[in-house]
């Protein structure tokens, strides 16, 4: 019997829930939520989850929309755990430079960079 | 005449400088710097630049190694600017949900997720 279902599966399910409950969530016509103006999503996790909190407080709870917010809260928990792991291990300069090079390489190839 | 060199060019130059000055940078055998234990680099920008600060304070300055740290500081400035843009614009719920869906989609396909 599996001991844990991976976060990737949680994300997939959450996408399906989000798609289903979209109509209910957009019912509030007056609500405004901060939306990042670029696509480097990982830089904006704090603001994204603040927005989710705002949305949750303004949404009529009950039934399966609760499940969506539960999943989103578990995703936040996962990301918070990842953030904790940013500074946990102290290594030699060599290993730090490997990581820095990798970070810049990813920035070079994958980030959406405007001047 | 161009008014600004794009960040993408700055990143490319920095990668080259990093490669050139690696030997000088790893000269300090005793120095230990926090290194993230996962590859979701954008979540760790704060810790990465703290590490760069530590490294700079322990590195003999002069010549082109100074250029490397200047570039890294400009990259930090760019990222700080991007982080500011995470919460600047308030939009309708619909647009927030588009961004959230995109974020989860990216998480689903591009993040390195361990259970």
């Amino acid at each position: 019997i599996p001991t844990e279902i991976p976060t990737s599966a949680l994300v997939k399910e959450t996408l399906a829930l989000l798609s289903t409950h979209r109509t209910l969530l957009i019912a509030n016509e007056t609500l405004r939520i901060p939306v990042p103006v670029h696509k480097n999503h990982q830089l904006c996790t704090e603001e994204i989850f603040q927005g989710i909190g705002t949305l949750e407080s303004q949404t009529v709870q009950g039934g399966t929309v609760e499940r969506l917010f539960k999943n989103l809260s578990l995703i936040k928990k996962y990301i918070d755990g990842q953030k904790k792991k940013c500074g946990e291990e102290r290594r030699r300069v060599n290993q730090f430079l490997d990581y820095l090079q990798e970070f810049l390489g990813v920035m070079n190839t994958e980030w959406i960079i405007e001047s | 005449i161009p008014t600004e060199i794009p960040t993408s060019a700055l990143v490319k130059e920095t990668l080259a400088l990093l490669s050139t000055h690696r030997t000088l940078l790893i000269a300090n055998e005793t120095l230990r710097i926090p290194v993230p234990v996962h590859k979701n680099h954008q979540l760790c920008t704060e810790e990465i630049f703290q590490g760069i600060g530590t490294l700079e304070s322990q590195t003999v300055q002069g010549g082109t190694v100074e250029r490397l740290f200047k570039n890294l500081s400009l990259i930090k400035k760019y990222i700080d600017g991007q982080k500011k843009k995470c919460g600047e614009e308030r939009r309708r719920v619909n647009q927030f949900l588009d961004y959230l869906q995109e974020f989860l989609g990216v998480m689903n396909t591009e993040w390195i997720i361990e259970s």
């Epitope: 279902i5 949680l10 289903t20 039934g63 399966t64 499940r67 578990l74 | -």
Partner: nanobody, 119 residues
Framework: QVQLQESGGGLVQPGGSLRLSCAAS????????MSWVRQAPGKGLEWVSS????????YYEDSVKGRFTISRDNANNTLYLQMNSLKSEDTALYHC????????????WGQGTQVTVSS
Amino acid sequence: QVQLQESGGGLVQPGGSLRLSCAASGFTFSNYYMSWVRQAPGKGLEWVSSISSDGSNTYYEDSVKGRFTISRDNANNTLYLQMNSLKSEDTALYHCATDLYDDSWYDHWGQGTQVTVSS
């Protein structure tokens, strides 16, 4: 104690159908959201489909949409997965799962039933 017991798996040819069942006991079945997850040989667990406690909302992973149908019978504490147009990539051990605790995701699941799609 909580028990989830799957059945209905087997060997089927591509394009064929199967109906999986999951008998639940030890908790108030009708109060809980239920799901099917699967694990293909050498792969990680994958979410397949979910259903709300009253059965009014159903959700599917993109690759099974239009081919699989999840349903439940709250009177008999049973969860179902009707699988049509089966493909070789559906070969996996299928588990039904639920979560009884607020801060966890699928904390209870069954032993699983094996589905093999092969000609």
